[in-house]
């Protein structure tokens, strides 16, 4: 069932700035008198279908009105999604004999952008380098998950990573930050050798990645970082 009873709303993800459809299913073989769409218990639209002509569509919410559309089956389409579109939607289909209720919860998620790694590293006299790396993305919220990996192992489940690197023991080592939400993920790798190499102390730059088509992008003169972007 694409649409759900009011007890268990269908969870629908929308991407900020894009479009989403809340799918509506009709009672089989019954003539529909009217359909009411509600947003957070406030009327959104009132539709009266006609067999021989176009349906009457009365949009009752001016805020979303210009961004509202309906499919041939009266599923709701909302374009240019905004964060304030998040919430509870309901459709009531009234027939001669019954009223069918469909419930939805719309969650708006941001496509992750601009992954950055900030580096504060120290090279000690014993040649051990202590790396303090912090990963961030633009407009991160609670639904963004961060982790740091090296050679397939998880080293951190947070935006930050603290790790010691000894060039005498370890060979070239890349540390990768992965930022992920339900609609996108970004990754950014930094090289321990390049962050620590040849300097007694380092207040590192901020490495920045932009989601552009290049799969590998050197982001500073020493090419210490590279970045990937996935949907």
């Amino acid at each position: 069932d694409a649409s759900q009873s009011s007890l268990t709303p269908l969870m629908v993800n929308g991407i900020l700035g894009e479009s989403v459809t809340l799918p509506l299913e009709f009672p089989a073989g019954e003539k529909v008198n009217f359909i009411t769409w509600l947003f957070n218990e406030t009327s959104l639209a009132f539709i009266v279908p006609h067999e021989t002509k176009s349906p009457e569509i009365h949009v009752t919410n001016p805020k979303q009105g210009k961004r509202l559309n309906f499919t041939q089956s009266y599923s709701l389409q909302l374009s240019n999604l905004k964060m304030e579109d998040t919430g509870s939607y309901r459709a009531q289909i009234s027939t001669k004999t019954s009223a069918k209720l469909s419930s939805y919860t719309l969650r708006i998620l941001r496509q992750l952008r601009n992954i950055q790694v900030t580096n504060h590293s120290q090279l000690f006299q014993n040649m051990t380098c202590e790396l303090h790396l912090t990963c961030s993305v633009e407009d991160a919220d609670d639904n963004v998950s961060f982790r740091w990996e090296a050679l397939g192992n998880t080293l951190s489940s947070q935006p930050n990573l603290t790790v010691s690197w000894d060039p005498r023991i370890s060979s070239e080592q890349d540390y990768t930050c992965i930022a992920e939400n339900a609609v996108s993920n970004l990754s950014f790798s930094v090289s321990a050798q390049k962050l620590c190499g040849g300097r007694s102390s380092l207040e590192g730059p901020r490495f920045e990645g932009k989601p552009i088509p290049n799969p590998l992008l050197g982001l500073d003169s020493t090419r210490t970082g590279h970045h990937h972007h996935h949907h």
């Epitope: 993800n13 998950s145 998880t154 489940s157």
Partner: antibody
Framework: QIQLVQSGPELKKPGETVKISCKAS????????MNWVKQAPGKGLKWMGW????????TYADDFKGRFAFSLETSASTAFLQISNLKNEDTATYFC???????????WGQGTPLTVSS | EIVLTQSPTTVAASPGEKITITCSAS???????LHWYQQKPGFSPKLLIY???KLASGVPGRFSGSGSGTSYSLTIGTMEAEDVATYYC?????????VGAGTKLELK
Amino acid sequence: QIQLVQSGPELKKPGETVKISCKASGYTFTNFGMNWVKQAPGKGLKWMGWINTYSGEATYADDFKGRFAFSLETSASTAFLQISNLKNEDTATYFCARRGGTAEFDYWGQGTPLTVSS
Amino acid sequence: EIVLTQSPTTVAASPGEKITITCSASSSISSNFLHWYQQKPGFSPKLLIYRTSKLASGVPGRFSGSGSGTSYSLTIGTMEAEDVATYYCQQGIYMPLTVGAGTKLELK
């Protein structure tokens, strides 16, 4: 090896406050978040929230906003759960669980049973 | 919040039997963020399978996981007496993190 060791059983009266500790060892404490999970007697697992062990920023599930507080003593690799104004329905076993890379609970404490009774 | 519905609620099986437990999510979940736990009576839960199909350290090979989107499953290839426990699925991509109500596996 990685271990999470929690403080012992607690018996409290309604209205009192309890503070449960969770001491971590075997890994870099500030690299992994810490979750708190409630299990009422005979019931399932309920996620209470988690704390970023580097920044100290806490995130609480809706049912655990207000009387519940997560905190840290980073130098001792210890996370704390404090529950104030205790109610009978707080009677449960509370677990700390380390947050893995994809928000799995990869290591668990042994649990701290809390009984709230007048 | 994402609701995870586990079925069956209880299952009784004999040693050697194949068992499958399902976990249905109210919204599509990235398979990287669906995990399974085993809790034996009187013990803490233990991570069993993470990222849908990866076995946690020390977990026997008779356990396996699969699924995508809104539908996931945990399979025990050949049930053993020591597998008597309650099994939980959990999603980690949406806040709040949520856990299924559990499936109790008993010995027939």
